[in-house]
């Protein structure tokens, strides 16, 4: 229904706390360089204005759209051009072009320092001093670094953070209580960020239809007892929620997500038998829980998929009458039978099925033509299954760090022109798939591996889009979203690449590396490894292992030495010489 004042409506629906949190996230995602204090001031002004509209919906400007209200606030920020350059040009436009312009200026890789977690004691002191301001800083710091983070989900992570601090700051050993818990939240939040960015990419590049297909497959796997009409309704609603969040309409997104959670909990009987525990939780936890609820038990009496989609004499007629609905039912039926497949694979199969019908229904004898379509799915299914087996075997053999290094070598050979920091980040993220997925039961591995890899590769594509340097990467990133992972997997050594000349300074290290945390040490070593591959793209695994073992030994020796600086300055050049010889 239409409301006289949109801002009053959203304030009433969401409540002050969530309203303020979402407005802070929205501003932080649009203007990523502004400080927390600057944004907090704007949030307070918007909230005060919303309250006047709640009191009197006819008050001045209360009838304006949220984009107009928020955009006007952002455009009133002093020194906008000095701090944000051409983003300031957005302010010369009218809505809806102005909001589109802001969206286009979101930076997926902002030049902000990595957020270092402060010491436990200091965190607890400042959290106790002002929990609201502390959590505001958390929202701001995450949102500006992840401009497409799913806003209602970020509120959920902030709530988790708050609960952890409340619990651990009361403990004697705050550090050992906080560290594992906050590490867990951070890991989950980072995965959530790349997954949501993938959804927004799908929406931006291929439109709502592509996202809705993703949603149908995912929901059908999770709720195999729901009928097609129910799945379609859920997919339509979920598409709307995601479109709003990806489009910066965070208040609407959070409000609609709450409505969707409410609907699901009120209609459990027709959706799934697994929802009750989620539905007993408060709002943020409920919506989060529903988004990752376990798959319902598959109906025992499902007929073979071939009956309706291959053997039926009316296949072409049914397809011609309503293509999207027919393909939707195929995707639904296939997905509910295959919780063990990745969504990407299910969408590739649906695409193959569509292409087969397009070709065969134009021929003289369609059934003879499309009769083998299910058999033609086999290679498409085998490819990711083999990928999972090969990579999980390698992960089990090498462990996470060694597996990351193997991926780093592989991807540096595929795209040596890509910057070393991007390659290292990508390889570290891709390598985490082992820890995340390879320990799962067999039937959960494939969906976990492939859908996670697809999300990470989407980030590689976004970073590469900014400064395209590799034709290999451009080729894989230009195609459809579901074909990206197979495309990257199929890439081999880039034969067009002219190896980098050997620079001794790239492999020169100083004693400060000894005091770095383990993660930073790994990144330094992985940076050196990528540079080695760029110097010798065709180096064998054995050669690279020799060099890296030597390098690790050198670090170990010099970091244990009484005079570290002398050790690094004398042994370092010897290491560089040995490396050159080993790779000659």
């Amino acid at each position: 229904e239409a409301h006289k004042s949109e801002i009053a409506h959203r304030y009433n629906d969401l409540g002050e706390q969530h309203f303020k949190g979402l407005v802070l996230i929205a501003f932080s995602q649009y203007l990523q360089k502004c400080s927390y204090d600057e944004h907090a001031k704007l949030v307070q002004e918007v909230t005060d204005f919303a309250k006047t509209c709640v009191a009197d919906e006819s008050a001045a400007n209360c009838d304006k759209s949220l984009h107009t209200l928020f955009g006007d606030k952002l455009c009133a920020i002093p020194n906008l051009r000095e701090n944000y350059g051409e983003l300031a040009d957005c302010c010369t436009k009218q809505e809806p072009e102005r909001n589109e312009c802001f969206l286009q200026h979101k930076d997926d890789n902002p030049s902000l320092p990595p957020f270092e977690r402060p010491e436990a004691e200091a965190m607890c002191t400042s959290f106790k001093e002002n929990p609201t301001t502390f959590m505001g800083h958390y929202l701001h710091e995450v949102a500006r670094r992840h401009p497409y983070f799913y806003a209602p989900e970020l509120l959920y992570y902030a709530e988790q953070y708050n609960e952890i601090l409340t619990q651990c700051c009361a403990e004697a050993d705050k550090e050992s209580c906080l560290t594992p818990k906050l590490d867990g939240v951070k890991e989950k939040a980072l995965v959530s960020s790349v997954r949501q960015r993938m959804k927004c990419s799908s929406m931006q590049k291929f439109g709502e239809r592509a996202f809705k297909a993703w949603a149908v497959a995912r929901l059908s796997q999770t709720f195999p007892n729901a009928d097609f009409a129910e799945i379609t309704k859920l997919a339509t609603d979920l598409t709307k929620v995601n479109k709003e969040c990806c489009h910066g309409d965070l208040l609407e997104c959070a409000d609609d997500r709450a409505e969707l959670a409410k609907y699901m909990c009120e209609n459990q009987a027709t959706i799934s038998s697994k929802l009750q525990t989620c539905c007993d939780k408060p709002l943020l936890k409920k919506a989060h829980c529903l988004s990752e609820v376990e798959h319902d038990t598959m109906p025992a009496d499902l007929p073979a998929i071939a009956a309706d989609f291959v053997e039926d004499q009316e296949v072409c007629k049914n397809y011609a009458e309503a293509k999207d609905v027919f393909l939707g039912t195929f995707l639904y039926e296939y997905s509910r039978r295959h919780p063990d497949y990745s969504v990407s694979l299910l969408l590739r199969l649906a695409k193959k099925y569509e292409a087969t019908l397009e070709k065969c229904c134009a021929e003289a004898n369609p059934p003879a033509c499309y009769g083998t379509v299910l058999a033609e799915f086999q290679p498409l299914v085998e490819e990711p299954k083999n990928l999972v087996k090969t990579n999980c075997d390698l992960y089990e053999k090498l462990g996470e760090y060694g597996f990351q290094n193997a991926i780093l070598v592989r991807y540096t050979q595929k795209a040596p022109q890509v910057s070393t920091p991007t390659l290292v980040e990508a390889a570290r993220n891709l390598g985490r798939v082992g820890t995340k997925c390879c320990t799962l039961p067999e039937d959960q591995r494939l969906p976990c591996v492939e859908d996670y890899l697809s999300a990470i590769l989407n980030r590689v594509c976004l970073l590469h889009e900014k400064t395209p340097v590799s034709e290999h990467v451009t080729k894989c990133c230009s195609g459809s979203l579901v074909e990206r992972r197979p495309c990257f997997s199929a890439l081999t050594v880039d034969e067009t690449y002219v190896p980098k000349e050997f620079k001794a300074e790239t492999f020169t290290f100083h004693s400060d590396i000894c005091t770095l945390p383990e993660k930073e040490k790994q990144i330094k070593k992985q940076t050196a490894l990528a540079e080695l591959v760029k110097h010798k793209p065709k180096a064998t695994a054995e050669q690279l292992k020799t060099v890296m073992d030597d390098f690790a030994q050198f670090l170990d020796t010099c970091c244990k030495a009484a005079d570290k600086d002398t050790c690094f300055s004398t042994e370092g050049p010897n290491l560089v010489t040995r490396c050159k010889d080993a790779l000659a």
Partner: nanobody, 116 residues
Amino acid sequence: EVQLLESGGGLVQPGGSLRLSCAASGFTFWVYQMDWVRQAPGKGLEWVSSISAFGAKTLYADSVKGRFTISRDNSKNTLYLQMNSLRAEDTAVYYCAKLSGKFDYWGQGTLVTVSS
């Protein structure tokens, strides 16, 4: 790497005012309590003032109470010390310090000379 850079010191007459600044980098400034510490010529270190993460709590040495005001701007990662009614005994090198946490970090100091 943590860096603290003080500025604003100089020569001032008794009864005059100065405002010291400390630009912080290399750590999450808004989470930490910050302090000012001074060292008069030939003397030991003397704690002057401290401020909590969000500025809600401030503490002062008795010798400066009512004359000095500590403040911070978390959006600029900067700590301040407003010094009024300066006396000859306030002459010292003033250090900005991050004393909470596992390690202490100090700036290189800024010299304040109060003399007629």
